[in-house]
Interface confidence: low
Protein backbone atom coordinates (compact mmCIF):
# COMPACT_ATOMS: atom_id res chain seq x y z
CA UNK A 1 0.00 0.00 0.00
CA UNK A 2 1.23 3.48 -0.80
CA UNK A 3 1.71 5.74 2.22
CA UNK A 4 -0.66 8.62 2.81
CA UNK A 5 0.83 11.75 1.21
CA UNK A 6 -0.11 14.03 4.12
CA UNK A 7 0.60 13.62 7.81
CA UNK A 8 -0.89 15.77 10.55
CA UNK A 9 0.67 15.61 14.01
CA UNK A 10 -1.34 14.78 17.14
CA UNK A 11 -1.56 18.43 18.22
CA UNK A 12 -2.96 19.57 14.86
CA UNK A 13 0.04 21.89 14.73
CA UNK A 14 2.21 20.63 11.87
CA UNK A 15 1.10 19.04 8.64
CA UNK A 16 3.52 17.72 6.01
CA UNK A 17 2.51 16.58 2.52
CA UNK A 18 4.81 14.77 0.11
CA UNK A 19 3.15 14.37 -3.26
CA UNK A 20 5.39 12.04 -5.21
CA UNK A 21 2.84 10.36 -7.52
CA UNK A 22 2.77 11.55 -11.15
CA UNK A 23 -0.92 12.42 -10.73
CA UNK A 24 -1.35 13.18 -7.06
CA UNK A 25 -4.64 13.51 -5.25
CA UNK A 26 -4.27 17.13 -4.13
CA UNK A 27 -7.48 16.90 -2.09
CA UNK A 28 -5.42 15.00 0.52
CA UNK A 29 -4.02 18.38 1.54
CA UNK A 30 -7.41 19.36 3.00
CA UNK A 31 -6.51 17.51 6.18
CA UNK A 32 -3.97 20.30 6.76
CA UNK A 33 -6.65 22.99 7.23
CA UNK A 34 -6.40 22.79 11.02
CA UNK A 35 -2.59 23.08 11.13
CA UNK A 36 -0.51 26.12 12.09
CA UNK A 37 2.56 24.96 10.17
CA UNK A 38 2.05 23.43 6.72
CA UNK A 39 4.66 21.94 4.37
CA UNK A 40 3.76 20.86 0.84
CA UNK A 41 6.39 19.15 -1.30
CA UNK A 42 5.30 18.46 -4.85
CA UNK A 43 7.97 15.95 -5.87
CA UNK A 44 9.30 18.10 -8.71
CA UNK A 45 5.96 18.13 -10.53
CA UNK A 46 5.06 20.69 -13.17
CA UNK A 47 1.95 22.49 -11.91
CA UNK A 48 1.10 23.96 -15.34
CA UNK A 49 -1.95 21.65 -15.73
CA UNK A 50 -3.35 23.18 -12.55
CA UNK A 51 -4.01 26.42 -14.45
CA UNK A 52 -6.65 24.64 -16.55
CA UNK A 53 -8.48 23.54 -13.39
CA UNK A 54 -8.45 26.81 -11.47
CA UNK A 55 -9.45 30.32 -12.41
CA UNK A 56 -6.34 32.27 -11.44
CA UNK A 57 -8.12 35.54 -12.28
CA UNK A 58 -11.17 34.86 -10.07
CA UNK A 59 -11.87 37.44 -7.38
CA UNK A 60 -10.26 35.99 -4.24
CA UNK A 61 -12.65 37.93 -1.99
CA UNK A 62 -15.17 35.12 -2.49
CA UNK A 63 -12.82 32.88 -0.47
CA UNK A 64 -11.98 35.53 2.16
CA UNK A 65 -14.07 34.16 5.05
CA UNK A 66 -12.91 30.58 4.51
CA UNK A 67 -9.25 31.59 4.24
CA UNK A 68 -9.43 33.85 7.32
CA UNK A 69 -10.56 30.85 9.35
CA UNK A 70 -7.41 28.88 8.53
CA UNK A 71 -4.91 28.52 11.37
CA UNK A 72 -1.88 28.43 9.09
CA UNK A 73 0.91 30.79 10.14
CA UNK A 74 3.87 29.13 8.40
CA UNK A 75 3.65 27.68 4.92
CA UNK A 76 6.42 25.91 3.02
CA UNK A 77 5.99 24.99 -0.62
CA UNK A 78 8.72 23.02 -2.32
CA UNK A 79 9.88 20.94 -5.27
CA UNK A 80 7.73 22.05 -8.18
CA UNK A 81 7.63 23.93 -11.44
CA UNK A 82 5.11 26.71 -10.87
CA UNK A 83 3.64 29.08 -13.46
CA UNK A 84 3.93 32.67 -12.18
CA UNK A 85 0.20 33.12 -12.78
CA UNK A 86 -0.55 30.26 -10.37
CA UNK A 87 1.83 31.68 -7.76
CA UNK A 88 0.09 35.03 -8.01
CA UNK A 89 -3.31 33.39 -7.69
CA UNK A 90 -2.16 31.67 -4.50
CA UNK A 91 -0.70 34.91 -3.10
CA UNK A 92 -3.96 36.75 -3.79
CA UNK A 93 -5.96 34.16 -1.85
CA UNK A 94 -3.39 33.95 0.97
CA UNK A 95 -3.61 37.73 1.37
CA UNK A 96 -6.83 37.04 3.31
CA UNK A 97 -5.15 34.50 5.57
CA UNK A 98 -3.19 34.96 8.80
CA UNK A 99 -0.06 33.59 7.17
CA UNK A 100 3.10 35.14 8.62
CA UNK A 101 5.99 33.09 7.24
CA UNK A 102 6.22 31.82 3.68
CA UNK A 103 9.05 29.55 2.54
CA UNK A 104 9.54 28.65 -1.11
CA UNK A 105 12.22 26.06 -1.86
CA UNK A 106 13.41 24.12 -4.89
CA UNK A 107 10.96 25.85 -7.19
CA UNK A 108 11.17 26.90 -10.80
CA UNK A 109 8.85 29.83 -11.48
CA UNK A 110 7.92 30.06 -15.15
CA UNK A 111 6.48 33.08 -16.95
CA UNK A 112 6.14 36.63 -15.65
CA UNK A 113 4.16 37.84 -12.67
CA UNK A 114 1.37 40.24 -13.63
CA UNK A 115 1.15 43.59 -11.81
CA UNK A 116 -0.96 43.85 -8.67
CA UNK A 117 -4.53 44.90 -9.56
CA UNK A 118 -5.64 48.17 -7.93
CA UNK A 119 -8.33 46.48 -5.84
CA UNK A 120 -6.06 43.65 -4.65
CA UNK A 121 -4.59 43.52 -1.16
CA UNK A 122 -1.00 42.44 -0.58
CA UNK A 123 0.09 39.54 1.60
CA UNK A 124 1.04 40.74 5.11
CA UNK A 125 4.04 38.48 5.65
CA UNK A 126 6.54 38.91 8.45
CA UNK A 127 9.04 36.50 6.97
CA UNK A 128 9.80 35.37 3.43
CA UNK A 129 12.39 32.64 2.89
CA UNK A 130 13.52 31.51 -0.54
CA UNK A 131 15.91 28.61 -1.17
CA UNK A 132 16.91 27.42 -4.64
CA UNK A 133 14.12 29.29 -6.41
CA UNK A 134 14.68 30.22 -10.05
CA UNK A 135 12.65 32.88 -11.82
CA UNK A 136 12.08 33.24 -15.55
CA UNK A 137 12.26 37.01 -15.14
CA UNK A 138 15.93 37.08 -14.06
CA UNK A 139 17.02 40.08 -11.99
CA UNK A 140 13.57 41.70 -11.74
CA UNK A 141 12.05 38.84 -9.74
CA UNK A 142 12.24 40.56 -6.35
CA UNK A 143 10.52 43.70 -7.61
CA UNK A 144 7.77 41.58 -9.19
CA UNK A 145 7.26 39.53 -6.03
CA UNK A 146 7.47 42.57 -3.76
CA UNK A 147 4.40 44.24 -5.26
CA UNK A 148 2.31 41.29 -4.04
CA UNK A 149 3.47 41.82 -0.44
CA UNK A 150 2.54 44.47 2.09
CA UNK A 151 5.47 46.67 3.14
CA UNK A 152 5.67 45.18 6.66
CA UNK A 153 8.10 42.34 5.81
CA UNK A 154 10.54 41.91 8.72
CA UNK A 155 12.70 38.96 7.63
CA UNK A 156 13.95 38.14 4.14
CA UNK A 157 16.11 35.10 3.46
CA UNK A 158 17.44 34.25 0.00
CA UNK A 159 19.63 31.14 -0.31
CA UNK A 160 21.01 29.32 -3.36
CA UNK A 161 19.66 32.08 -5.56
CA UNK A 162 20.13 31.76 -9.30
CA UNK A 163 20.23 35.56 -9.48
CA UNK A 164 21.21 37.00 -6.09
CA UNK A 165 21.62 40.49 -7.58
CA UNK A 166 18.42 42.50 -7.96
CA UNK A 167 17.22 45.08 -10.42
CA UNK A 168 17.63 47.87 -7.88
CA UNK A 169 15.83 50.59 -9.82
CA UNK A 170 12.65 48.47 -9.84
CA UNK A 171 12.81 47.40 -6.18
CA UNK A 172 10.91 49.56 -3.68
CA UNK A 173 12.29 50.13 -0.19
CA UNK A 174 11.66 47.52 2.52
CA UNK A 175 10.91 49.95 5.36
CA UNK A 176 10.34 47.34 8.09
CA UNK A 177 12.95 44.75 7.11
CA UNK A 178 15.17 44.14 10.15
CA UNK A 179 16.80 40.84 9.15
CA UNK A 180 18.32 40.02 5.77
CA UNK A 181 19.89 36.60 5.27
CA UNK A 182 21.81 36.04 2.02
CA UNK A 183 23.66 32.97 3.33
CA UNK A 184 24.44 29.97 1.13
CA UNK A 185 25.06 31.94 -2.03
CA UNK A 186 28.72 30.93 -2.47
CA UNK A 187 29.01 32.77 -5.79
CA UNK A 188 27.87 36.09 -4.36
CA UNK A 189 31.24 37.59 -3.41
CA UNK A 190 31.85 41.16 -2.34
CA UNK A 191 30.98 42.65 -5.74
CA UNK A 192 27.76 40.64 -5.82
CA UNK A 193 26.96 41.86 -2.31
CA UNK A 194 27.23 45.44 -3.54
CA UNK A 195 24.74 44.61 -6.31
CA UNK A 196 22.36 42.80 -3.94
CA UNK A 197 22.33 45.50 -1.26
CA UNK A 198 20.41 48.04 -3.30
CA UNK A 199 21.31 51.47 -1.87
CA UNK A 200 18.71 52.90 0.53
CA UNK A 201 16.27 50.04 -0.07
CA UNK A 202 17.04 48.36 3.27
CA UNK A 203 16.98 51.25 5.77
CA UNK A 204 15.99 49.29 8.88
CA UNK A 205 18.38 46.32 8.74
CA UNK A 206 19.60 45.21 12.16
CA UNK A 207 20.79 41.69 11.32
CA UNK A 208 22.71 40.73 8.21
CA UNK A 209 23.76 37.13 7.62
CA UNK A 210 26.34 36.36 4.94
CA UNK A 211 27.39 32.81 5.81
CA UNK A 212 29.01 30.90 2.94
CA UNK A 213 28.73 33.74 0.45
CA UNK A 214 32.25 33.92 -0.95
CA UNK A 215 33.27 36.92 1.12
CA UNK A 216 37.05 37.46 1.20
CA UNK A 217 37.84 40.14 3.79
CA UNK A 218 35.89 41.96 6.48
CA UNK A 219 37.14 45.22 4.93
CA UNK A 220 35.60 44.32 1.57
CA UNK A 221 32.27 43.66 3.28
CA UNK A 222 32.59 46.95 5.15
CA UNK A 223 32.97 48.78 1.83
CA UNK A 224 29.89 47.06 0.37
CA UNK A 225 27.80 47.98 3.43
CA UNK A 226 29.01 51.58 3.35
CA UNK A 227 28.19 51.89 -0.36
CA UNK A 228 24.65 50.62 0.26
CA UNK A 229 24.07 52.69 3.38
CA UNK A 230 23.33 49.51 5.33
CA UNK A 231 24.20 49.72 9.04
CA UNK A 232 23.49 46.39 10.73
CA UNK A 233 23.79 45.82 14.47
CA UNK A 234 24.84 42.22 13.93
CA UNK A 235 26.83 40.79 11.03
CA UNK A 236 27.44 37.08 10.42
CA UNK A 237 30.42 36.34 8.16
CA UNK A 238 30.95 32.78 9.38
CA UNK A 239 31.69 29.91 6.97
CA UNK A 240 33.56 32.13 4.53
CA UNK A 241 37.24 31.57 3.68
CA UNK A 242 38.41 34.94 4.93
CA UNK A 243 41.84 36.44 4.37
CA UNK A 244 43.37 38.04 7.44
CA UNK A 245 45.40 40.59 5.49
CA UNK A 246 44.04 43.58 3.64
CA UNK A 247 45.16 44.72 0.20
CA UNK A 248 47.47 47.65 1.06
CA UNK A 249 46.17 49.68 -1.88
CA UNK A 250 42.53 49.25 -0.78
CA UNK A 251 41.10 52.32 0.95
CA UNK A 252 40.53 51.96 4.69
CA UNK A 253 36.86 51.42 5.53
CA UNK A 254 35.15 52.93 8.55
CA UNK A 255 32.64 50.50 10.06
CA UNK A 256 29.29 51.87 11.15
CA UNK A 257 29.15 52.59 14.88
CA UNK A 258 25.83 50.68 14.92
CA UNK A 259 27.65 47.35 14.47
CA UNK A 260 28.04 45.62 17.84
CA UNK A 261 28.15 41.91 17.01
CA UNK A 262 30.43 40.23 14.46
CA UNK A 263 30.58 36.48 13.77
CA UNK A 264 33.83 35.33 12.12
CA UNK A 265 33.62 31.65 13.15
CA UNK A 266 34.53 28.80 10.74
CA UNK A 267 36.39 31.28 8.54
CA UNK A 268 39.77 29.50 8.27
CA UNK A 269 41.56 32.40 9.94
CA UNK A 270 45.15 31.82 11.06
CA UNK A 271 45.33 35.28 12.60
CA UNK A 272 42.91 38.00 13.61
CA UNK A 273 42.01 39.88 10.43
CA UNK A 274 43.00 43.50 9.98
CA UNK A 275 40.42 46.23 9.59
CA UNK A 276 37.90 45.09 12.21
CA UNK A 277 35.63 47.63 13.92
CA UNK A 278 37.38 49.43 16.79
CA UNK A 279 34.69 48.50 19.30
CA UNK A 280 32.31 45.54 19.50
CA UNK A 281 30.05 44.01 22.11
CA UNK A 282 30.40 40.49 20.67
CA UNK A 283 33.14 38.98 18.51
CA UNK A 284 33.03 35.28 17.63
CA UNK A 285 36.34 33.85 16.35
CA UNK A 286 35.56 30.25 17.28
CA UNK A 287 36.49 27.26 15.11
CA UNK A 288 39.24 29.04 13.20
CA UNK A 289 42.94 28.10 12.85
CA UNK A 290 44.48 30.57 15.29
CA UNK A 291 47.67 28.94 16.59
CA UNK A 292 48.33 31.54 19.27
CA UNK A 293 46.24 33.70 21.56
CA UNK A 294 45.44 37.03 19.91
CA UNK A 295 47.35 39.98 21.38
CA UNK A 296 45.27 42.82 22.84
CA UNK A 297 46.44 45.22 20.12
CA UNK A 298 45.16 42.81 17.43
CA UNK A 299 41.63 42.81 18.78
CA UNK A 300 38.89 45.41 18.89
CA UNK A 301 37.66 46.62 22.25
CA UNK A 302 35.22 43.78 22.92
CA UNK A 303 32.95 42.75 25.82
CA UNK A 304 32.31 39.17 24.75
CA UNK A 305 35.03 37.31 22.83
CA UNK A 306 34.64 33.66 21.78
CA UNK A 307 37.77 31.73 20.78
CA UNK A 308 36.61 28.13 21.36
CA UNK A 309 37.84 25.47 18.95
CA UNK A 310 41.07 27.16 17.87
CA UNK A 311 44.26 25.05 17.84
CA UNK A 312 46.08 27.24 20.39
CA UNK A 313 43.46 26.26 23.00
CA UNK A 314 43.93 22.53 22.45
CA UNK A 315 47.22 21.24 23.93
CA UNK A 316 49.30 19.24 21.46
CA UNK A 317 47.42 20.37 18.35
CA UNK A 318 49.32 21.53 15.37
CA UNK A 319 47.74 23.80 12.81
CA UNK A 320 45.89 21.54 10.40
CA UNK A 321 47.36 21.62 6.92
CA UNK A 322 47.08 19.57 3.73
CA UNK A 323 47.98 15.93 4.33
CA UNK A 324 48.63 16.28 8.06
CA UNK A 325 47.09 13.95 10.60
CA UNK A 326 45.70 16.19 13.28
CA UNK A 327 45.11 14.12 16.39
CA UNK A 328 43.99 16.98 18.63
CA UNK A 329 40.28 17.22 19.18
CA UNK A 330 38.92 20.68 18.48
CA UNK A 331 35.77 21.13 20.54
CA UNK A 332 32.42 21.79 18.86
CA UNK A 333 33.90 22.38 15.43
Amino acid sequence: TTPEPCELDDEDFRCVCNFSEPQPDWSEAFQCVSAVEVEIHAGGLNLEPFLKRVDADADPRQYADTVKALRVRRLTVGAAQVPAQLLVGALRVLAYSRLKELTLEDLKITGTMPPLPLEATGLALSSLRLRNVSWATGRSWLAELQQWLKPGLKVLSIAQAHSPAFSCEQVRAFPALTSLDLSDNPGLGERGLMAALCPHKFPAIQNLALRNTGMETPTGVCAALAAAGVQPHSLDLSHNSLRATVNPSAPRCMWSSALNSLNLSFAGLEQVPKGLPAKLRVLDLSCNRLNRAPQPDELPEVDNLTLDGNPFLVPGTALPHEGSMNSGVVPAC
Epitope: K100, K154, V155, S157, T178, S179, Q206, N207, A209, S234
Partner: nanobody, 122 residues
Framework: QVQLQESGGGLVQSGGSLRLSCAVS????????MGWYRQAPGKGRELVAE??????NYADSVLGRFTISRDNAKNTVYLQMNSLKPEDTAVYYC?????????????????WGQGTQVTVSS
Amino acid sequence: QVQLQESGGGLVQSGGSLRLSCAVSGSIFSIVDMGWYRQAPGKGRELVAELSDGATNYADSVLGRFTISRDNAKNTVYLQMNSLKPEDTAVYYCNADLTGSSYSPYRYLEVWGQGTQVTVSS
Protein backbone atom coordinates in the same frame (compact mmCIF):
# COMPACT_ATOMS: atom_id res chain seq x y z
CA GLN B 1 14.36 32.99 26.36
CA VAL B 2 11.25 34.95 25.42
CA GLN B 3 8.35 34.58 27.84
CA LEU B 4 4.78 35.89 28.08
CA GLN B 5 3.16 36.53 31.43
CA GLU B 6 -0.62 36.99 31.58
CA SER B 7 -2.53 38.53 34.48
CA GLY B 8 -5.94 39.99 35.23
CA GLY B 9 -8.14 36.91 34.99
CA GLY B 10 -10.71 36.00 37.61
CA LEU B 11 -14.36 35.47 38.46
CA VAL B 12 -16.84 38.13 37.38
CA GLN B 13 -20.61 38.41 37.10
CA SER B 14 -22.40 38.54 33.76
CA GLY B 15 -22.29 42.12 32.42
CA GLY B 16 -19.10 42.89 34.32
CA SER B 17 -15.65 43.87 33.08
CA LEU B 18 -12.07 42.57 33.31
CA ARG B 19 -8.77 43.80 31.93
CA LEU B 20 -6.16 41.22 30.95
CA SER B 21 -2.48 42.12 30.61
CA CYS B 22 0.32 40.26 28.89
CA ALA B 23 3.94 41.29 29.33
CA VAL B 24 6.73 40.07 27.03
CA SER B 25 10.14 39.54 28.61
CA GLY B 26 13.40 38.49 26.96
CA SER B 27 15.62 39.71 24.19
CA ILE B 28 13.43 40.92 21.34
CA PHE B 29 14.21 43.00 18.30
CA SER B 30 10.73 43.11 16.87
CA ILE B 31 7.28 42.02 17.97
CA VAL B 32 5.22 41.48 14.85
CA ASP B 33 1.78 40.62 16.19
CA MET B 34 0.31 40.26 19.65
CA GLY B 35 -3.04 38.78 20.39
CA TRP B 36 -5.39 36.94 22.72
CA TYR B 37 -6.85 33.49 22.18
CA ARG B 38 -9.21 31.53 24.38
CA GLN B 39 -10.05 27.91 24.98
CA ALA B 40 -13.32 26.90 26.59
CA PRO B 41 -13.60 23.42 28.17
CA GLY B 42 -13.81 20.75 25.48
CA LYS B 43 -13.32 23.24 22.66
CA GLY B 44 -10.42 24.28 20.43
CA ARG B 45 -8.35 27.42 20.91
CA GLU B 46 -9.87 30.37 19.05
CA LEU B 47 -8.69 33.87 18.22
CA VAL B 48 -10.30 36.59 20.35
CA ALA B 49 -8.42 39.70 19.27
CA GLU B 50 -5.16 40.50 17.55
CA LEU B 51 -2.97 43.52 16.85
CA SER B 52 -1.03 43.12 13.62
CA ASP B 53 1.19 45.99 12.45
CA GLY B 54 -1.19 48.46 14.06
CA ALA B 55 -4.38 46.92 12.62
CA THR B 56 -6.86 45.21 14.94
CA ASN B 57 -8.74 42.00 14.25
CA TYR B 58 -11.59 40.70 16.46
CA ALA B 59 -13.68 37.55 16.58
CA ASP B 60 -17.29 38.33 15.64
CA SER B 61 -18.51 37.15 19.06
CA VAL B 62 -16.55 39.86 20.94
CA LEU B 63 -16.82 42.75 18.48
CA GLY B 64 -17.92 45.94 20.26
CA ARG B 65 -17.38 44.44 23.72
CA PHE B 66 -13.63 43.71 23.81
CA THR B 67 -10.80 46.12 22.99
CA ILE B 68 -7.18 45.15 22.39
CA SER B 69 -4.39 47.68 22.90
CA ARG B 70 -0.63 47.68 23.22
CA ASP B 71 2.02 49.63 25.10
CA ASN B 72 5.17 49.34 22.99
CA ALA B 73 7.39 50.90 25.66
CA LYS B 74 6.38 48.19 28.13
CA ASN B 75 6.13 45.38 25.54
CA THR B 76 2.67 44.70 26.93
CA VAL B 77 -0.66 43.98 25.31
CA TYR B 78 -4.03 44.47 27.04
CA LEU B 79 -7.51 43.08 26.52
CA GLN B 80 -10.32 45.19 27.96
CA MET B 81 -13.37 42.97 28.26
CA ASN B 82 -16.74 44.66 28.87
CA SER B 83 -20.30 43.31 28.96
CA LEU B 84 -18.99 39.84 29.74
CA LYS B 85 -21.23 36.85 29.11
CA PRO B 86 -21.14 33.30 30.55
CA GLU B 87 -20.05 32.03 27.11
CA ASP B 88 -16.86 34.12 27.48
CA THR B 89 -15.75 31.69 30.21
CA ALA B 90 -12.45 30.17 29.11
CA VAL B 91 -8.71 30.11 29.65
CA TYR B 92 -7.33 33.17 27.86
CA TYR B 93 -3.90 32.84 26.27
CA CYS B 94 -1.59 35.58 25.15
CA ASN B 95 0.24 35.05 21.85
CA ALA B 96 3.16 36.94 20.33
CA ASP B 97 4.77 36.54 16.94
CA LEU B 98 8.39 37.63 17.12
CA THR B 99 11.32 38.17 14.82
CA GLY B 100 14.84 38.89 15.97
CA SER B 101 14.34 37.01 19.22
CA SER B 102 17.22 35.65 21.24
CA TYR B 103 16.61 32.25 19.62
CA SER B 104 17.60 33.47 16.18
CA PRO B 105 17.31 36.84 14.50
CA TYR B 106 16.34 35.20 11.21
CA ARG B 107 13.41 33.14 12.36
CA TYR B 108 9.77 34.03 12.78
CA LEU B 109 8.74 32.65 16.14
CA GLU B 110 5.40 32.12 17.87
CA VAL B 111 5.31 32.28 21.67
CA TRP B 112 2.41 31.45 23.98
CA GLY B 113 1.69 32.37 27.58
CA GLN B 114 0.56 29.91 30.24
CA GLY B 115 -3.01 31.21 30.21
CA THR B 116 -5.27 32.98 32.70
CA GLN B 117 -8.72 31.72 33.71
CA VAL B 118 -11.73 33.96 33.12
CA THR B 119 -15.02 32.76 34.62
CA VAL B 120 -18.28 34.63 34.02
CA SER B 121 -21.14 33.60 36.28
CA SER B 122 -24.76 34.20 35.45
